[in-house]
Each structure stands twice: as structure tokens, then as C-alpha cells.
């Protein structure tokens, strides 16, 4: 379980059309459910229920976003529609280039994501918890455009990776 180095860039726009960027670094872990490789894309926040099958349509999106899913306490979802791994797969099927799970309220999900899969996803599936998860969710909850870059080596210089 390698460390995943995640850089999150928040874009704050002003009425004049200019924008300021704020970069936050945090760490997670690459799970065995996915590949250990770099990925980058705009963050799209998803609720676990949004990765179920009840919707009556294809629900496809443009390829290349990073799904951020805050898992709930297991008691809230005693009979989940899909396993955590199934939800990661569904996000990738919908066009996610990577999935980041906040497992703070459901630490059992770590074991589910790390059970050796015969057919792991070809995209990274990362989990975060604790202070790193709080940092990530604080940014996501701002309802502003943010991009995430996931790497398996520590970033050297933020400017090296983002062409603003």
C-alpha cells in the first residue's frame, strides 16, 4: 500500500474574471483495488448513493474527472447497493480517471479496498482519512472548481505540475 501524494488546487475567481489558485498537499494510500499511477482531473464530489444503479439513464460524464466520495457510517447504509469496490468501478465506468474515498467514518472500507482483486481497476483508487480527509473535504465543500493531482512520488514543486 504505497503512499499517494495528492495536490489539490482550488480556483477562486473574482468578478473581474481573474482567478487565484490555492494549492494544498495531502497524503493518502493507493489501494489494491486500483493501479498505482499518477492521475489528474477536476474534482467531482459524489455521494455513495450516487454510485448506485437505480437511475434510469446512462449517467455518463466527460472522461477525466477525479471522483471524491465520503463514505458514510455503515449503520446508515446497512444493505449497500454495491460494495466499495463496486462503487469505485462504477465511478471509473462513468469516466473518472481516479477515485478518492474518505474512509474516516467507515474504516472497514480500507480492508475491502485492499482485498486482492483478480481484476483491479486500471485507474488509481486512493483512500484518505483523519486530518488529510478533513483538508480534502474542506476544499470540496467550498463548491468551487478544484483539481486534484495524484502521484506516487512526492511532488517537487507545485508549479511544475499545473499549467495555469
Amino acid at each position: 500500500k504505497e503512499t499517494a501524494f495528492v495536490e489539490v488546487v482550488l480556483f477562486e475567481s473574482s468578478p473581474s474574471g481573474d482567478y487565484t489558485t490555492y494549492t494544498t498537499g495531502l497524503t493518502g494510500r493507493f489501494s489494491r483495488a486500483g493501479a498505482t499511477l499518477s492521475a489528474e482531473g477536476e474534482i467531482v464530489q459524489m455521494h455513495p448513493l450516487g454510485l448506485c444503479n437505480n437511475n434510469d439513464e446512462e449517467d455518463l460524464y466527460e472522461y477525466g474527472w477525479v471522483g471524491v466520495v465520503k463514505l458514510e457510517q455503515p449503520e446508515l447504509d446497512p444493505k449497500p447497493c454495491l460494495t466499495v469496490l463496486g462503487k469505485a468501478k462504477r465511478a471509473v465506468q462513468r469516466g473518472a480517471t481516479a477515485v478518492i474515498f474518505d474512509v474516516s467514518e467507515n474504516p472497514e472500507a480500507i480492508d475491502q479496498l485492499n482485498q486482492g482483486s483478480e481484476d483491479p481497476l486500471k485507474r488509481p483508487v486512493v483512500y484518505v482519512k483523519g486530518a488529510d480527509a478533513i483538508k480534502l473535504m474542506n476544499i470540496v465543500n467550498k463548491q468551487k472548481v478544484a483539481r486534484a493531482r495524484i502521484q506516487h512520488r512526492p511532488p517537487r514543486q507545485p508549479t511544475e505540475y499545473f499549467d495555469m
Partner: antibody, heavy 119, light 107 residues
Amino acid sequence: QVQLVQSGAEVKKPGASVKVSCKASGYTFTNYKMHWVRQAPGQGLEWMGKINPSSGSTSYAQKFQGRVTMTRDTSTSTVYMELSSLRSEDTAVYYCARSGAGMWYFDLWGRGTLVTVSS
Amino acid sequence: DIQMTQSPSSLSASVGDRVTITCRASQDIYRYLNWYQQKPGKAPKLLIFAASSLHSGVPSRFSGSGSGTDFTLTISSLQPEDFATYYCQQSYTTPITFGQGTKVEIK
């Protein structure tokens, strides 16, 4: 700034059509579904349908089938709702609303467009 | 279509009161239930999604609960800015449907 900006109020005669626009900004237009919800004066909220800006696929409420058309222009991040064969009961405020990824809760709304149908 | 029934249709309360609004679905919608607040002349605002998840920026005095067919929106201590109309909405399947609304007025 994440927002939906709708076109201005319209007054139409019965039998005519109206086309309302909704321009999205501050987020990736194709990553979120767009819905149209209307509210007649003093009444509740009524869902009309939705469009996937990425694919252009639509789903309409049965009540509006055949009278409503939702389209999008990805180059301007704008969705349109056209309602034809207008009648007085169509007098309402028409809202566009963005839904959260994979779920149909509406986390961002336009200010609404008042459409008045009167002879 | 799934019918959504809210009760009461209106209520009078005072600042500081605990207010509870209920919403019943005509069939099982699991937790695909959302709550909105609307003030006169304004667009609705999302308060709660997925039955109990608080939307970002919404004060913690608002909470939601329920699963299946019966749901509740609770305002733990009513504030002056909370006087408005509240709607529940099911997002289990299309057509998406709303409750008829509950108007919370000043006593």
C-alpha cells in the same frame, strides 16, 4: 463564481412557444445534469425534465412530453428549455437547476424566469 | 409516479422552537430524499440531500432523518431567517416529484 444565469421574463399568447436559456459558469458544464423545474403562482414545485449536457440525452416528465424540448450548447455552456402550445396554466416561474453527480438533488439554481401566458 | 405528502401544510412557531416537518413517499425510496427551503420571490435552496446529509454552508440546526417511506426535517432551534416554505423531493426515480410544501410562519 459557480452560478446559473437565466434569460429574462417573457409574455406570450396562448398557442405560442417560449424558449428560456440558462447559462452555467464556474464549473465544468458537462459534469453535471441540468433540470428544469417550474412553479405556478402560489403553487409548489413541478419537475419538467432533465438534460445531460455531455451527451445531450434528455428525459421529460410525461405531462410535458411532446410539448417540451431541452437542448444544450456546450460551446457557451448554456441549456435551453422550449415549451410549445402555451396555455394560461403554463404561467409560472421556470427554474434551471443543476443536480449533484449521479444523484438528482439540486445544489445550484438559477434565479428563475417568469413566463406569463395571456391573451 | 411517486407521490410525496408533507405534513403539516403550514405551522406557526416562535424563534427558538424545535420544528419538525414530515414527508411520506407512496413507495420505498430508500434514502433518495432531499429537502429545500424557499423564501418568497427566491429560488429554492438545498438543505439536506440523501435523507440526512447536510449541504455545505447549511447551519447545523437543520437535520434530516428517515429511510424507506417516512422522512423528517428538524430545525432544532428556529431562527428568524428560517421562516419560509420547505419542500421534500424524491430523487429515486423519474419523474422527480416534490411534496406540496410546508409553510413555517411566525407565531
